[in-house]
């Protein structure tokens, strides 16, 4: 199944000697290294782990290993001037004041450079004003506050929970109701799994820590100064008035004690409803303004943080093809952390890192992978995915006609419950025969397939026997490969059993108890779980750049195309008097994914007779499969997201971590019943299933038989 | 072993000054909010104030405040109350005492020093 | 802000069970703290949040606080439980620390 012309291994045994090279004892070894200070993007510190980086991926036996500079805007906490949170009485003194830094943790008291807990590109401002509580931010509740309990939010300081969606959707919501300021905060419902002990002792949350993270609505468009072009020597720079995806309100993360301070004390409306609780002991009382004896406090924001056009560094290395050098598979994953990064991302580049000693040992031994292989070691991806768009915006023209796929490699683990994939569709069959031919690391399953136990603790909600694998959604580094340049893409990495949470994150997500010992001790004391992902992102990797036919399966596109269409439809007829009045009709979308359907399985057989001795025909077939992807962009965009231009897939407008499905016509029915213009919005719905099902029949033809 | 050490009371005048310290070992002391607790002679507890484990908060009780200052330097793992303007009801045992919960806000005092001695009289 | 009345003395034989109140103002809705202390030695927590015991404390320690009254519990009474035993709230409205009074445990 894998072979290559160029190579001194027994070809069957390429891919058993790859994997057999990866030890999880260096996992181990590179995650410690990686984690003992803090890599935070711009710094000095990251600078010299991209240098550490370059330079063993040179001794590991790498072709070449290259530095990719730009200079981006980023965002920074003033040093001499904290930013906090506090409350004033009628005086205007501060009474109480929230955290300027998180406790730090046994043996890194005396680490220098731990940026404190602060939302990256807040603006500067010291509002003040009575406090909302907004539940998780989301459109939902914002929805649930201003049309059902009539509350408006214009010119208050908001307070909402951290989880659900992604922190700059909560933002954005924020401004659209008018807010002056957003408090961030991780609530124990959300950040303290039960009968699990607080760091230190355990992986739960303390009360002192605190999420950071970006609040850019950047849709895509990487660093907010140079849109759609690398922000290189020679850039063109917008005005800070003009930078796209900047939040126009303070925001500022706090943790939970804190929070009781705040919201302890909260009156007004009582929480519309239980999902409105968390788990202080306090009323969740939604406001506006403190209670009875405390109405005449207000909530104060100091915030200073400065906004930097800085030096940042990719690492690049390559190990060129034997057979088919002009063609890409990338391993790419983050380097730059809040902190430490023991999860995020150091869990992830570790994995890499034994990933490519693994490959250099066979290429010094002399095997070379058919097609070429690019490691990229990616910088402020905390920022807003920065490094790798950027790199991506430089080498677009090439990416977009050499880009076979790319395997996002951010934190390897989450959990160590079992197995969690995002791909494209092309790829499920590849995951599927990888891992049933891998070992599963979880107990109980001894002697079973990775692909056993992930099938039994993650099911498919549509196939018996079949594990799921979710929608690419966006908040990693794949985003500009796969949403805007229409590269196959997929992640993988171990999980926690906590579906209802799926995007809060664990605990500890980008606090500074993201430590080398939290994984230690806590998660994955053996590595199991991290060799296991290491297989997985590597065995990828390793068919994609290797096998003569590219091991990509167009039926599995066809399936889900059909589920979205029906799911997409189903939204639709909830409006059927509108559907009818205004002439909507799916039959161009039903009949482009059904003729997709079929093109898609002539080619599947053709796939399987064709004359695989024939270069040229091996080549043209390969291309079909490389270009299918592609074919699902539209060069226009989506309407408002000119970077997000898959027409199948886009990150969901209410929450960045999560993939939608059909978006152009989702959006455009969103919420139709409350806009002002029926007749325009139901105009653009025709003119999104247009778009999608011209796409969709696009796509089939690029299957087709070429001549 | 965790132990706190007070340092600096004695016989003083009052409207006089003196500068307490509390030196502390065997845990990671700024991670914990510290306090001041007194107890005058053949009287209860009488908590003075706490300063929060980064500085963010100072509080005090209100017989002590505008009189007394709460600092900690986190480097050399010391708390210190600079008091002035003392009076003779200051007159105390001065304990030094922990917060129960690392990083929390206060709520009780798990660890106490031995105490110093603090006479203010004429 | 609040105030914590607590009996001045309770005595009590060996072997039988103590018990101190500590009354006041909205105790029941703040964790109550229960601190030993012997002459001339610094206090000692041996309750927290009501009802938590510290490692090192015996088992005949226990806390309890409903209403508006919390109450220390020492079972099997020795003679080493004489001492001064206080009980404490945060005032988290004020920001304040606050101590009863003290009650003298009086072994017989």
């Known amino acids: 199944k894998s072979s290559n012309e160029a190579t001194n291994i027994t070809p069957k045994h390429n891919m058993k000697a790859f994997l057999d090279e990866l030890k999880a004892e260096n996992i181990k070894k590179f995650l410690y290294n990686f984690t003992q200070i803090p890599h935070l993007a711009g710094t000095e510190q990251n600078f010299q782990l991209a240098k550490q980086i370059q330079s063993q991926w040179k001794e590991f036996g790498l072709d070449s290993v290259e530095l990719a500079h730009y200079d981006v805007l980023l965002s920074y906490p003033n040093k001499t001037h904290p930013n906090y949170i506090s409350i004033i009485n009628e005086d205007g003194n501060e009474i109480f004041n929230t955290s300027l830094f998180e406790p730090p943790p046994p043996g890194y008291e005396n680490v220098s450079d731990i940026v404190p807990p602060f939302s990256a590109f807040s603006p500067q401002g010291m509002p003040e004003g009575d406090l909302v509580y907004v539940n998780y931010a989301r459109t939902e509740d914002f929805f649930k506050l201003e049309r059902d309990m009539k509350i408006n939010c214009s010119g208050k300081i908001v307070i909402a929970r951290y989880g659900k969606v992604f922190r700059g959707n909560k933002v954005k919501n924020a401004q659209l109701a008018g807010a002056k300021g957003v408090i961030l905060y991780s609530d124990p419902a959300d950040y303290f799994a039960p009968g699990v002990k607080s760091y230190p002792d355990g992986w739960n949350l303390p009360g002192g820590g605190v999420q950071r993270g970006n609040i850019l609505n950047l849709n895509g468009a990487g660093d907010p100064l140079t849109p759609g072009y690398p922000a290189n020597e020679y850039a063109y720079r917008r005005g800070i008035a003009e930078a796209v995806g900047l939040p126009s309100i303070p925001v500022h993360p706090i943790g939970y004690y804190d929070a009781q301070k705040l919201l302890e004390k909260m009156g007004g409306s009582a929480p519309p409803d239980s999902s409105w609780r968390g788990s202080l002991k306090v009323p969740y009382n939604v406001g506006p303004g403190f209670t009875g004896n405390f109405s005449t406090q207000k909530v104060k924001m100091h915030i200073h943080s400065t906004n930097e056009v800085t030096r940042i560094y990719n690492v690049i290395g390559t190990l060129r093809g034997a057979v088919e050098p002009d063609r890409y598979v990338i391993l790419g994953g983050h380097r730059d952390s809040w902190v430490f990064g023991g999860i995020d991302p150091q869990s992830g580049a570790a994995v890499v890192h034994e990933i490519v000693r693994s490959f250099g040992t066979l290429k010094k031994e002399g095997w070379r992978p058919r097609r070429t292989i690019l490691f990229a070691s990616w910088d402020a991806e905390e920022f807003g995915l920065l490094g790798s768009t950027e790199w991506a915006e430089e080498n677009s023209r090439l990416l977009q006609e050499r880009g076979v796929a790319y395997i996002n490699a951010d934190s390897s683990i989450e959990g160590n419950y079992t197995l969690r994939v995002d791909c494209t569709p092309l790829m499920y069959s590849l995951v599927h025969n990888l891992t049933k031919e891998l070992k599963s690391p979880d107990e109980g399953f001894e002697g079973k397939s990775l692909y056993e136990s992930w099938t039994k603790k993650s099911p498919s909600p549509e196939f018996s026997g079949m594990p799921r694998i979710s929608k690419l959604g966006s908040g990693n580094d794949f985003e500009v490969f796969f949403q805007r340049l229409g590269i196959a893409s997929g992640r993988a990495r171990y999980t926690k059993n906590w579906e209802t949470n799926k995007f809060s994150g664990y605990p500890l997500y980008h606090s500074v108890y993201e430590t080398y010992e939290l994984v230690e001790k806590f998660y994955d004391p053996m590595f199991k779980y991290h060799l296991t992902v290491a297989q997985v992102r590597g065995g990828m990797v390793f068919e994609l750049a290797n096998s003569i036919v590219l091991p990509f399966d167009c039926r599995d596109y066809a399936v889900v195309l059909r589920k979205y269409a029906d799911k997409i439809y189903s939204i639709s007829m909830k409006h059927p008097q509108e559907m009818k009045t205004y002439s909507v009709s799916f039959d161009s979308l039903f009949s482009a994914v059904k003729n997709f359907t079929e093109i898609a399985s002539k080619f599947s057989e053709r796939l399987q007779d064709f004359d695989k001795s024939n270069p040229i025909v091996l080549r043209m077939m390969n291309d079909q499969l490389m270009f299918l992807e592609r074919a699902f962009i539209d060069p226009l965009g989506l309407p408002d997201r000119p970077f997000y231009r898959h027409v199948i897939y886009a990150p969901s407008s209410h929450n960045k971590y999560a993939g939608e499905s059909f978006p152009g016509i989702y959006d455009a029915l969103f919420d139709i019943e409350s806009k002002v213009d029926p007749s325009k919005a139901w105009g653009e719905v025709k003119r999104q299933i247009y778009v999608a099902a011209f796409t969709v029949q696009a796509a089939a033809e690029t299957l087709s038989e070429v001549a | 072993q965790v132990q706190l050490v007070e340092s600096g009371g004695g016989e003083v005048q009052p409207g006089r000054s003196l500068r307490l310290s509390c030196a502390a070992s065997g845990f990671s002391f700024s991670g914990y909010g510290m306090h001041w607790v007194r107890q005058a002679p053949g009287k209860g507890l009488e908590w003075v104030a706490v300063m929060s484990y980064d500085g963010s908060n100072r509080f005090y009780v209100d017989s002590v405040r505008g009189r007394f200052s709460i600092s900690r330097d986190n480097s050399k793992n010391t708390l210190y109350l600079q008091m002035n303007s003392l009076r003779p009801e200051d007159t105390a045992v001065y304990y030094c005492a922990r917060d129960t919960v690392w990083g929390s806000h206060p709520d009780a005092f798990d660890i106490w020093g031995q105490g110093t001695v603090v006479t203010v009289s004429s | 802000q609040s105030v914590l009345t607590q009996p001045p003395s309770v005595s009590v034989a060996p072997g039988q069970t103590a018990r101190i109140t500590c009354g006041g103002n909205n105790s029941g809705s703040k964790s109550v703290h229960w601190y030993q202390q012997k002459p001339g030695q610094a206090p000692v927590l041996v309750v927290y949040?009501?009802?938590d015991r510290p490692s090192g404390i015996p088992e005949r320690f226990s806390g309890s606080n409903s209403g508006n009254t919390a109450t220390l519990t020492i079972s099997r009474v020795e003679a080493g439980d004489e001492a001064d035993y206080y009980c404490q709230v945060w005032d988290s409205s004020s920001d304040h620390g606050v101590f009863g009074g003290g009650t003298k445990l009086t072994v017989l």
């Open positions: 949040d009501d009802s």
